[in-house]
Amino acid sequence: LSEEADDTDSELGSMKPLHTFCAMKADDGPCKAMIRSYFFNMYTHQCEEFIYGGCEGNENRFDTLEECKKTCIPGYEKTAVKAASGAERPDFCFLEEDPGLCRGYMKRYLYNNQTKQCERFVYGGCLGNRNNFETLDECKKICENPVHSPSPVNEVQMSDYVTDGNTVTDRSTVNNIVVPQSPKVPRRRDYRGRPWCLQPADSGLCKASERRFYYNSATGKCHRFNYTGCGGNNNNFTTRRRCLRSCKTGLIKNKSKGVVK
């Protein structure tokens, strides 16, 4: 059996954060957008993801993981430089691939100690271990020695696809669920709201059936759809009210003439 090293404690456990706001709890604020953000968690001494509502909140909120780490983790830039120069890699870079307990299909990257390179793997969506990066860049920065790494290959952006075994499947028909596509989408210049409100409903990658709402920019209304429990996009709200509050405000009336091809 593949037994994982205990990677639940951060190496920086005893250190104090660099700024007082790094000690604040994650605050999603009163608004109901779903913006992926990062905060420094005082308990785990790591930067972690949370969903920001789009307004108010506090200073312990960052657009990128990197920004959060630089701001709140003492000595992070030094250790990142060390790792990049090949002098020292964090222990978690040597952990074996762990897809985790759950079975969503999420594209992630891990450092492979055999090949000495960062590689793509499919993460199940929960638990697993810290050898698990959202981007190839982040994996390379932290775990790979750039001296030995080949020049970056132009990678196809896979964010709109999921890998299922060796095949690449268009997400609009994952799990035999045909995602409702908006018949008409207003020109982007006619919609001044949040960009994800223009995205089609995406039922996601798992097998649950959860009632959610998405904003249909053609009708200016929020419609119900079945969400499978993981994956998908940000045009995904737990109530119609939240959906309308988040997306309706951006529509400029009487301007929806064209269709985006």
């Epitope: 994982e4 308990y43 993801e49 307990l101 079975r103 969506g125 929960c126 638990l127 429990g229 998908g232």
Partner: antibody
Framework: EVQLQQSGPGLVKPSQTLSLTCAIS??????????WSWIRQSPSRGLEWLGI?????????RYAVSVKSRITINPDTSKNQFSLQLNSVTPEDTAVYYC?????????????WGQGTLVTVSS | DIVMTQSPLSLPVTPGEPASISCRSS???????????LNWYLQKPGQSPQLLIY???NRASGVPDRFSGSGSGTDFTLKISRVEAEDVGVYYC?????????FGQGTKVEIK
């Protein structure tokens, strides 16, 4: 319907090894849409997760730090069951022990539990 | 470890009346797209626990619609819209954001 049937002794002497087995029907121990866990319950500790095993092209296990040096959870694919071994037990390990299935596809939770086995550690 | 704290620890209820149980986690349990890494279980007297609510707000198979889960971040609530006699037992919340998986200390619901 998934059923988990526990077996093993209810009385173990201090410093000995606690051994329990959980027989699975209605699912496979090597299913890639499940994980198999042991959880115990005592008045002092409440529900305490001990460890889990799961198969995703190969076997994985994770254990609670509190018992990590003493615990082993193993699958037995030929009998479609999994077992718990807890070494060097003390009276503190007295509890009701449950095996449980973690549903990896839909629920993402412990959706099936064994009947529970009260294990008393006493000389 | 993520600490799960439930309140109240004991909840006397009247059949037909609503009931509410709170669960607070020591760190955020919300993942992207609104997935909440939190489950609720009910352990009826003399029985093993059973899954009630998964991913924060979704009822498990066979669970009556009088049960609902809500909350985000670190604060979660289990509500019973109209308590029935068969709902007595101990209710537990459980997180699976990180290892070790941890449970709340339980809320005992009993009929007044």
């Amino acid at each position: 319907e998934v059923q988990l049937q526990q077996s093993g002794p209810g009385l173990v002497k201090p410093s000995q090894t606690l051994s329990l087995t959980c027989a699975i029907s209605g699912d496979s121990v090597s299913s890639d849409s499940a994980a198999w866990s042991w959880i115990r319950q005592s008045p002092s500790r409440g529900l305490e997760w001990l460890g889990i095993i799961y198969y995703r092209s190969k076997w994985y296990n994770r254990y609670a730090v509190s018992v990590k040096s003493r615990i082993t959870i193993n699958p037995d694919t030929s009998k479609n069951q999994f077992s718990l071994q807890l070494n060097s037990v003390t009276p503190e390990d007295t509890a009701v022990y449950y095996c449980a299935r973690w549903h990896s596809d839909k629920h993402w939770g412990f959706d099936d539990w064994g009947q529970g086995t009260l294990v008393t550690v006493s000389s | 470890d993520i600490v799960m704290t439930q309140s109240p620890l004991s909840l006397p209820v009247t059949p037909g009346e609503p009931a509410s149980i709170s669960c607070r986690s020591s760190q955020s349990l919300v993942f992207r797209f609104g997935i909440t890494y939190l489950n609720w279980y009910l352990q009826k007297p003399g029985q093993s626990p059973q899954l009630l609510i998964y991913k924060g707000s979704n009822r498990a198979s066979g669970v009556p619609d009088r049960f609902s889960g809500s909350g985000s971040g670190t604060d979660f609530t289990l509500k019973i819209s109209r308590v029935e006699a068969e709902d007595v037992g101990v209710y537990y919340c459980q997180q699976y954001t990180s290892y070790p998986l941890t449970f709340g200390q339980g809320t005992k619901v009993e009929i007044k």
